[in-house]
C-alpha cells in the first residue's frame, strides 16, 4: 500500500534485522516500476499487523526470501 497518492516509494526507512518467517503474515515484493524505481520488500507481521520495510540488499533478508520461496515450493503441488 503506497504511503500516499503523491509520494513515489513506500519505504522511507528500511530494516536489516532478521525476520522469523513464522512471524510473517504476508511478504510483498514490489518490483521497481515507473512509480518507484527500486524493489521494495514489505513484511506484514502477525503481531499487530505491523508492516516493515526490509532491505533487499541485506544478507538476512536474502536468506528470508530463500526460506519463504522454499516453503512456498513445498506447498505447491
Amino acid at each position: 500500500v503506497p504511503l500516499s497518492r503523491t509520494v513515489r516509494c513506500t519505504c522511507i526507512s528500511i530494516s536489516n534485522q532478521p525476520v522469523n518467517p513464522r512471524s510473517l503474515e504476508k511478504l510483498e515484493i514490489i518490483p521497481a516500476s515507473q512509480f518507484c524505481p527500486r524493489v521494495e520488500i514489505i513484511a506484514t507481521m502477525k503481531k499487530k499487523g505491523e508492516k516493515r520495510c526490509l532491505n533487499p540488499e541485506s544478507k538476512a533478508i536474502k536468506n528470508l526470501l530463500k526460506a519463504v520461496s522454499k516453503e512456498r515450493s513445498k506447498r505447491s503441488p
Epitope: 504511503l3 500516499s4 497518492r5 516509494c9 526507512s13 528500511i14 536489516n16 524505481p37 508492516k51 532491505n55
Partner: antibody, heavy 120, light 108 residues
C-alpha cells in the same frame, strides 16, 4: 546510545542563507529516512522536509519549497538543511527526526533542536 | 491539506485520573495517525503510531484508538511526568505531513 545532534542555528538577516547539520550516532544512519520539523516560539510543530534513507526521494512543505534543500551524507552520518532566502516566519527551533523503521511516517528519534532567528 | 483539530486545548486533571485527548481530521486519514508528547524545553517523543501501536519503551498506560476522522489518546492513570503537551500527526495523502495544534495536560 541512539542520538541526533543538530547544529548551525544562528541569528540571520532576512534574505540570507544558513545551513543546519544533524549528526547521527548509535544506529545505522544509512537505513533510515530523516525529517526536519520546526517549532516557532510558543507555537506547535510544523513538518518541513523529508529525505529517503538512500537520498533518492525528497519532499518539502509548501512554505519552504524552492528555498530549502534537504540532503544526507551516509558516509558522514549527517543530515543537512540548506536554508536560502530566509524570512522572519522561518524563525523557529529546528529539529531533525528519524523516520520509524516500519512502513509508516512517524518520528521515533529527535534531536534537541537548534534555534534559527531571522531578524533585521 | 488535511487539518487536524485537537480538543480540548487545555485539560486540567489530577495525578491518578484518566485523560482522554481527541484529534479530529478534516477528511479520513484511515489509521495513519501518530501521537507525540512534548515537555517544556524538550523535543517531542513518539508515543503511538498507526493509530494504536505503542512505540518502543512507551508505558502501557498510553493507548491510542480510532480510524477515519476521529482518534483518541487515552492515559489510563496520570503520572506526574505525564503533564505535558500532546500532538497528533497524520500522513494520509502526504506531503504535507500535518500536526494538530496540541492539547496541554496540566495539573489541576
Amino acid at each position: 546510545q541512539e542520538q541526533l545532534v543538530e547544529s548551525g542555528g544562528n541569528v540571520v538577516q532576512p534574505g540570507r542563507s544558513l545551513r543546519l547539520s544533524c549528526a547521527a550516532s548509535g544506529f545505522t544512519f544509512s537505513t533510515y529516512g530523516m525529517h526536519w520539523v520546526r517549532q516557532a516560539p510558543g507555537k506547535g510543530l510544523e513538518w518541513v522536509a523529508v529525505i529517503w534513507y538512500d537520498g533518492s526521494d525528497k519532499y518539502y512543505a509548501d512554505s519552504v519549497k524552492d528555498r530549502f534543500t534537504v540532503s544526507k551524507d551516509n558516509s558522514k552520518n549527517t543530515l543537512y538543511l540548506q536554508m536560502n532566502s530566509l524570512r522572519a516566519e522561518d524563525t523557529a527551533v529546528y529539529y531533525c527526526a528519524r523516520n520509524i523503521a516500519v512502513a509508516d511516517v512517524a518520528f521515533d528519534l529527535w534531536g534537541q533542536g537548534t534555534m534559527v532567528t531571522v531578524s533585521s | 491539506e488535511i487539518v487536524l483539530t485537537q480538543s480540548p486545548a487545555i485539560l486540567s486533571l489530577s495525578p491518578g485520573e484518566r485523560a482522554t485527548l481527541s484529534c479530529r481530521a478534516s477528511q479520513s486519514v484511515s489509521s495513519y495517525l501518530a501521537w507525540y508528547q512534548q515537555k517544556p524545553g524538550q523535543a517531542p517523543r513518539l508515543l503511538i503510531y498507526d493509530a494504536s501501536n505503542r512505540a518502543t519503551g512507551i508505558p502501557a498506560r498510553f493507548s491510542g484508538s480510532g480510524s477515519g476522522t476521529d482518534f483518541t489518546l487515552t492515559i489510563s492513570s496520570l503520572e506526574p511526568e505525564d503533564f505535558a503537551v500532546y500532538y497528533c500527526q497524520q500522513r494520509s495523502n502526504w506531503p504535507p505531513l500535518t500536526f494538530g495544534g496540541g492539547t496541554k495536560v496540566e495539573i489541576k
